[in-house]
């Protein structure tokens, strides 16, 4: 004999209290696959979360973060504050990048400047807290009399790119 519950589509549940008939999911609940004995409670996007997609009878709500925050974890399980470019988020809050490092994102940590000399190049544009060094041609490639910017202190390595 076929299980009568298997006929219940997504958006319904198999109601054992009503002779296993298919009942629609109550408000603020959903079932994304058929044949379920109950519906799942919809996710609520509150606090630093905001609705990216509202709940329907067949799919859960999806959240993202309010401006000034970004998602972490599968399905945006947490909102973490943004920092400014040129900063990194430490456990004690946003802090400026140390000399020789930069961050061109609003999240993550500061990255060491590119060390142009490792690839036989020279520094064309110095790095800042917000931007990586720009490397130019190798010193040998520069024509006589041409000058390159001297690297600022013992710079280490590279930078970051847009998402």
């Amino acid at each position: 004999l076929q299980d009568p519950c298997s006929n219940c589509p997504a958006g319904t549940f198999c109601d054992n209290n009503r002779n296993q008939i298919c009942s629609p999911c109550p408000p603020n609940s959903f079932s994304s696959i058929g044949g379920q004995p109950n519906c799942n409670i919809c996710r609520v996007c509150a606090g630093y979360f905001r609705f990216k997609k509202f709940c329907s009878s067949t799919s859960n709500a999806e959240c993202d973060c309010t401006p000034g925050f970004h998602c972490l974890g599968a399905g945006c399980s947490m909102c973490e504050q943004d920092c400014k470019q040129g900063q990194e988020l430490t456990k004690k809050g946003c802090k400026d990048c140390c000399f020789g490092t930069f961050n061109d994102q609003k999240r993550g940590i500061c990255r060491p400047w590119t060390n142009c000399s490792l690839d036989g190049k020279s520094v064309l544009v110095n790095g800042t807290k917000e931007r990586d060094v720009v490397c130019g041609p190798s010193p040998a490639d520069l024509s006589p009399g041409a000058s390159s910017v001297t690297p600022p202190a013992p710079a280490r390595e590279p930078g970051h790119s847009p998402q």
């Epitope: 972490l72 990194e88 430490t90 456990k91 140390c98 490092t101 961050n103 994102q105 999240r107 993550g108 940590i109 500061c110 990255r111 060491p112 590119t114 142009c116 490792l118 690839d119 990586d132 060094v133 720009v134 490397c135 280490r156 390595e157 590279p158 930078g159 970051h160 790119s161 847009p162 998402q163």
Partner: antibody, heavy 120, light 110 residues
Framework: QVQLVQSGAEVKKPGASVKVSCKAS????????MHWVRQAPGQGLEWMGW????????NYAQKFQGRVTMTRDTSISTAYMELSRLRSDDTAVYYC?????????????WGQGTLVTVSS | SYVLTQPPSVSVAPGETARITCGGD??????VHWYQKKPDQAPVLVVY???YRPSGIPERISGSNSGNTATLTLSRVEAGDEADYYC????????????FGGGTQLIILG
């Protein structure tokens, strides 16, 4: 979907060079740093360096400086790692791995690995 | 450069909880990432930034980090969890920014 496909296994003699490629698809190649990590037989994971595919800027672990060169060809969305003056202890599986769009997080996508064997 | 210390192996029976530690000076101030590595497969990121799971990683895998120790916890372990697990941090102040722990072999008993 994001995919990183690496070149095939190589056998090299000591003193030679090897160049491993990593072709990216399913995302904007220039928007995400690429890292290289290796694992020698019976050993752990070892970070080698990164390249910014947008600018070509690199950072190499000090251990490999002078022997490693990381480059990219944006026209074919491919990153390369060349290791020169190979020694027997460079025998390892070499992986490319993508950074998730900002520095300080985990490497979210990895290539399948390229076995490099250095033997006389 | 920065050093991460992991136990070589951890053994646990199926259905039990495995805890893998990663020690480092003031590691609680850093963001720790964990990778699962099975033979002849590429590493898989299972926890990032101390405690966040990428999509597709089961909820029974979790992470924590404070003081000098970060911990990866696998509850209700299964045979398929048998693998090597590596912790990793970024250390921008050193000439070797990418740092991995030595790895821990998770052995499922029985």
């Amino acid at each position: 979907q994001v995919q990183l496909v690496q070149s095939g296994a190589e056998v090299k003699k000591p003193g030679a060079s090897v160049k491993v490629s990593c072709k990216a698809s399913g995302y904007t190649f220039t928007g995400y740093y690429m890292h290289w990590v290796r694992q020698a037989p019976g050993q752990g994971l070892e970070w080698m360096g990164w390249i910014n595919p947008n600018s070509g800027g690199t950072n190499y672990a000090q251990k490999f400086q002078g022997r490693v060169t990381m480059t990219r060809d944006t026209s074919i969305s491919t990153a390369y790692m060349e290791l020169s003056r190979l020694r027997s202890d460079d025998t390892a599986v070499y992986y490319c791995a993508r950074e998730p769009g900002y520095y300080g997080s985990g490497l979210d996508y990895w290539g399948q690995g390229t076995l490099v064997t250095v033997s006389s | 450069s920065y050093v991460l210390t992991q136990p070589p192996s951890v053994s646990v029976a199926p259905g039990e909880t495995a805890r893998i530690t990663c020690g480092g000076d003031d590691i609680g101030d850093k963001r720790v990432h964990w990778y699962q590595k099975k033979p002849d497969q590429a590493p898989v990121l299972v926890v990032y930034e101390d405690r966040y799971r990428p999509s597709g990683i089961p909820e029974r895998i979790s992470g924590s980090n404070s003081g000098n120790t970060a911990t990866l916890t696998l509850s209700r372990v299964e045979a398929g969890d048998e693998a090597d697990y590596y912790c990793q941090v970024w250390d921008s102040s050193s000439d070797h920014p990418g740092v991995f722990g030595g790895g821990t072999q998770l052995i499922i008993l029985g």
